[in-house]
Amino acid sequence: TPLGPKWPEPVFGRLASPGFPGEYANDQERRWTLTAPPGYRLRLYFTHFDLELSHLCEYDFVKLSSGAKVLATLCGQESTDTERAPGKDTFYSLGSSLDITFRSDYSNEKPFTGFEAFYAAEDIDECQVAPGEAPTCDHHCHNHLGGFYCSCRAGYVLHRNKRTCSALCSGQVFTQRSGELSSPEYPRPYPKLSSCTYSISLEEGFSVILDFVESFDVETHPETLCPYDFLKIQTDREEHGPFCGKTLPHRIETKSNTVTITFVTDESGDHTGWKIHYTSTAQPCPYPMAPPNGHVSPVQAKYILKDSFSIFCETGYELLQGHLPLKSFTAVCQKDGSWDRPMPACSIVDCGPPDDLPSGRVEYITGPGVTTYKAVIQYSCEETFYTMKVNDGKYVCEADGFWTSSKGEKSLPVCEPVCGLSARTTGGRIYGGQKAKPGDFPWQVLILGGTTAAGALLYDNWVLTAAHAVYEQKHDASALDIRMGTLKRLSPHYTQAWSEAVFIHEGYTHDAGFDNDIALIKLNNKVVINSNITPICLPRKEAESFMRTDDIGTASGWGLTQRGFLARNLMYVDIPIVDHQKCTAAYEKPPYPRGSVTANMLCAGLESGGKDSCRGDSGGALVFLDSETERWFVGGIVSWGSMNCGEAGQYGVYTKVINYIPWIENIISDF
């Protein structure tokens, strides 16, 4: 009895022979048709079986069939060589229906009790297949109650037949100059029902070469050309193929920069497929010949489109394109077989003519005018009046294009004026004010600008003076008329200098005493040093030993003389240093305010008076001879004194220069 189409109830039940458990009658025929829902099968087993045994179960039997197939014909009680009894076997329908037929013939030799069987519907596991049978699904099979479904591995898609997995093998584009491509899963069998498209797309100018490698196995047919699976190669010029079978196709020189490879498979077959190694070629560029003193990298047998080379120069040579230096050079081969840039030169590094050395000269050691790599030059300073600072003056043209000293310095040496040279030597005893002779005080500077004052040359572009002497011109430095190299105040023969800037000590307060009475004038040009214009030295740390009480210093200037007029000729006076306490006491009496003499001052002069600096000498140097170096240095700056110059019991007061060395050095180095 077939069950209803909606399968509202579970399908199970019992079948038995007529009259069971009693004996069955003769000439009986009974048929049952069992139907399970789609995706289910029927399971049947016997709990009792007792039928007449006959050869091949010809007399009485139970026949089980599913569709057109007979599953079993059963009789007897136990199986024999030619007959089968069910015993403990379980029988399964092949599909969702099972037919059971019971038949007894016209007689029984003895009574038989027949059979009892039970059946039930159960899910078919479609994913289980017998050995040797084709799998239900290509890749993954998923069973569920009443059915199954297939799925595919990554890179595949389920075909519309719902069982086969087709490869997702289209749209791959190869843009490298060489590479490999193969059928999906190579060297394992390629997938069925797939259509693969591969593209090789190189820049215009390249030509693709295809080589089939390793093995080739694509389903073929003895009579028809590749009717099942095939490989085709298409360029913009021609089509190659179709290819199939087991023979490796020959090399294909496509003469094209774009190639499309199509591979199509059908639903059957088990073949390993193919593998292609592709390369490319192009019109070669001329072989690059390295310029002299250079080399090419990388070195290749040939250079084709997109290949490049660089030029590297030997040490001491630089890349030049025309006359312009290059940081690096790389040329690229173009599709027309030409290089994109002309070959550069490796030119010997030329440091160029060396810079002139102020107050010095340069000599070519390697050869006249030779300024190329490894050339040597020698700087020297003008003898007597200049000395070389920093290095020995020997410079070599190095690979970086710089003249470089043996210490590795790229800057010029410095010709520093020799300081403290004088034509005069001290006699050791005190003379009266005397006329200076040429070269006696070559550091002496005459400052005109409202009033007459003095200063002392430092280096070749600075003047040391008193703050009070230039205070009025601090904001108008150009108003200062600075003269040097002359003895006569009114002489038209002098070296003119102009001021660029005036630096007054920040601790100086005008019209409120003379503490910190010191100033520097920066000249707008360096002066040429000679026997009449020479800077004074600044005191060394050890200078105090030459400036003790009673040591002799020399003051010079064009200030007021005993006659009350400015001197026409430069005058000088040798005067001893006065004990500081003695000087302080001398200026503590009215009209001088208390504390007039500070630790930043030193005093010089005779207790008896008569020898002193005076108005017009302000800013000039009080100099001392350093007996160790045999050079004169500035110990004091003419600053102030008694209203009456050279008065007995009063002394000339000078700014103590040694206290201001850091201040002087800072300004000179900063400006």
């Epitope: 030049l320 394109q321 025309g322 006359h323 312009l324 230096p325 290059l326 940081k327 690096s328 030119s347 030329d350 160029g352 294009g401």
Partner: antibody, heavy 118, light 107 residues
């Protein structure tokens, strides 16, 4: 002492041709890896390279002005000449000549202001 | 013609460090040059071939160049460094100048 000095008209009418001369001293126009460049600077604007010529007579021009520019040198007079045709008010600028050495423009003239106006 | 881009202005306090950048495609593959121009004056070369200093240029000026950017650095900036600064490079055999940067030294 390297010096360069520009000379030429201070006023040019539109459509006219400008001729500028650069007189150099302190270096040779025929030897060494040196060149002379012309550069201009419109008022309040950036520097703009125009052309150069090297001792080897190798020349180069600003791409956008190539058709209007010509550079030449007279080694015997130590002069470099730049001509610029079809002048326009937008060409009003200070024109500098300068020396090129090792790729750097290391010495410049003081510049000459050229005004283009009718 | 390629473009070299500079910031229009840079402000710096005296004694501090000023950095001026110059950007251009693959500028690091080329040599960079830097010029200082004070009002009413001709430009002055302060750095050539990325990092070399012509004689007479103070040591506080330095340069570097890599990638797409060249940099001029003024360390311990002084009032006298207030000026316009231009970078320059060679493209093939044509010179290209930057847009210029005004450096202001704050009082």
């Amino acid at each position: 002492q390297v010096t360069l000095k520009e000379s030429g008209p201070v006023l040019v009418k539109p459509t006219e041709t400008l001729t500028l001369t650069c007189t150099v001293s302190g270096f040779s126009l025929s030897r060494g890896k040196m060149g002379v460049s012309w550069i201009r600077q419109p008022p309040g604007k950036a520097l703009e390279w125009l052309a150069h010529i090297f001792s080897s007579d190798e020349k180069s021009y600003r791409t956008s002005l190539k058709s209007r520019l010509t550079i030449s040198k007279d080694t015997s007079k130590n002069q470099v000449v730049l001509t610029m045709t079809n002048m326009d008010p937008v060409d009003t600028a200070t024109y500098y000549c300068a020396r090129i050495r090792r790729g750097g423009i290391d010495y410049w003239g003081q510049g000459t202001l050229v005004t283009v106006s009718s | 013609q390629p473009v070299l881009t500079q910031p229009p202005s840079v402000s710096v306090s005296p004694g501090q460090t000023a950095s001026i950048t110059c950007s251009g495609d693959k500028l690091g593959d080329k040599f960079a040059y830097w010029y200082q121009q004070k009002p009413g004056h001709s430009p002055v070369l302060v750095i050539y071939q990325d990092n070399k200093r012509p004689s007479g240029i103070p040591g506080r000026f330095s340069g570097s160049n890599s990638g797409n950017t060249a940099t001029l650095t003024i360390s311990g900036t002084q009032a006298m460094d207030e000026a316009d600064y231009y970078c320059q490079a060679w493209d093939s055999s044509t010179a290209v100048f930057g847009t210029g940067t005004k450096v202001t030294v704050l009082a």
